[in-house]
């Protein structure tokens, strides 16, 4: 019997309000055994996949999606979905990325602290959380 897959969660580091030109990393989380995490824009046809999955905790895996230099085109809602054979999960809640013009430099500390959306709270980091890998290849229209 197939297991019921928990919904993924999504969060953003360092936050959801990012100065133009700064970097942001979306973090998707799901159960152990996820082979592919997908980060989607509001339209499901625009997405990015990774199989570089790591442990977030003994019971969770995670994947990270980094945008090096945020532009206005990166603003908008994002959500996660994952593939754990033999099926895809439901989508996470949406997380809205806001891009703001800033007079400070690209690393000025005026971002909101890490924000997340999803059914579970992000567990605190531990000494083993060095963000580890996963498998199987899918076609992707790149988000960035």
């Amino acid at each position: 019997q197939e297991e019921d897959l928990p919904r993924p969660s999504i969060s953003a580091e360092p936050g959801t309000v990012i100065p133009l030109g700064s970097h942001v990393t979306f973090v998707c989380r799901g159960p152990v055994g996820v082979q592919t995490f997908r980060l989607e824009r509001e339209s499901r046809s625009t997405y990015n996949d990774t199989e570089d999955v790591s442990q977030a905790s003994p019971s969770e895996s995670e994947a990270r999606f980094r945008i090096d230099s945020v532009s206005e085109g990166n603003a908008g809602p994002y959500r996660c979905i994952y593939y754990k054979p033999p099926k895809w999960s439901e989508q996470s809640d949406y997380l809205e990325l806001l891009v703001k013009e800033t007079s400070g430099g690209p690393d000025s500390p005026d971002t909101e602290p890490g924000s997340s959306a999803g059914p579970t709270q992000r567990p605190s980091d531990n000494s083993h959380n060095e963000h580890a890998p996963a498998s199987q290849g899918l076609k992707a229209e790149h988000l960035y």
Epitope: S54, H131, Q136
Partner: antibody, heavy 117, light 107 residues
Framework: EVQLVESGGGLVKPGGSLRLSCAAS????????MNWVRQAPGKGLEWVAR??????????YYADSVKDRFTISRDDSKNTLYLQMNSLKTEDTAVYYC????????WGQGTLVTVSS | DIQMTQSPSSLSASVGDRVTITCLAS??????LAWYQQKPGKAPKLLIY???SLADGVPSRFSGSGSGTDFTLTISSLQPEDFATYYC?????????FGGGTKVEIK
């Protein structure tokens, strides 16, 4: 079909260097973390090194036994994984496998590295 | 580092037997555990990942169970092609340590 083909093994003297390569095909290389695992003759398996993807800043991890001597790297434009081995010791003699991460689901056929004077 | 203790180191069994191999982690690893089969002169083959998930193409007579620190690989009815060495590996944190292996031989 997923394929991982290692090359570059051979006989080298203690203190010498060798560079192993692993040509990957049949999957999306640049979204996968990759590993090297070795097996000394008649012995068990030992994880050697791992490299992550661009999303994770190509982070690298090493077994203590090879730290500061071995360097894992990748060229995503060539779908190739590398292992640069310096200051080789006799105890580095082993078959070296290239392995796709994180569940180590595909392995190459291995390449034999012999360190002997 | 997380130590993985596998037992037994070898066992003799007959075709049709039920075979159980255990792996003990020195600290909790949740379900970040894999099992591999290796035949002489060949690369290891993934059997089980995430402690209980069967890898693609692996016969259903293989199953994995356990979480935390205690794990088991079971072969429900041993077949001639199953005589090999089996390894567990923790994938929770680097270094990704393997168990010492279990050699399954013909009785």
């Amino acid at each position: 079909e997923v394929q991982l083909v290692e090359s570059g093994g051979g006989l080298v003297k203690p203190g010498g260097s060798l560079r192993l390569s692993c040509a990957a095909s049949g999957f999306t290389f640049n979204i996968n973390a990759m590993n090297w695992v070795r097996q000394a003759p008649g012995k068990g398996l030992e994880w050697v090194a791992r490299i992550r993807t661009k999303n994770n800043n190509f982070a690298t991890y090493y077994a203590d036994s090879v730290k500061d001597r071995f360097t894992i790297s990748r060229d995503d434009s060539k779908n190739t994984l590398y292992l640069q081995m310096n200051s080789l010791k006799t105890e580095d003699t082993a078959v070296y496998y290239c392995v796709r991460g994180p569940y180590f689901d595909y392995w190459g056929q291995g390449t034999l590295v012999t360190v002997s004077s | 580092d997380i130590q993985m203790t596998q037992s037994p180191s070898s066992l003799s069994a007959s075709v049709g037997d039920r075979v159980t191999i255990t792996c003990l982690a020195s600290q909790t690893i949740g379900t970040w555990l894999a099992w591999y089969q290796q035949k002489p002169g060949k690369a290891p083959k993934l059997l089980i990942y995430a402690a209980t998930s069967l890898a693609d193409g692996v016969p259903s007579r293989f199953s994995g169970s356990g979480s935390g620190t205690d794990f088991t690989l079971t072969i429900s009815s041993l077949q001639p092609e199953d005589f090999a060495t089996y390894y567990c590996q923790q994938l929770y944190s680097t270094p990704y340590t393997f168990g010492g292996g279990t050699k399954v031989e013909i009785k």
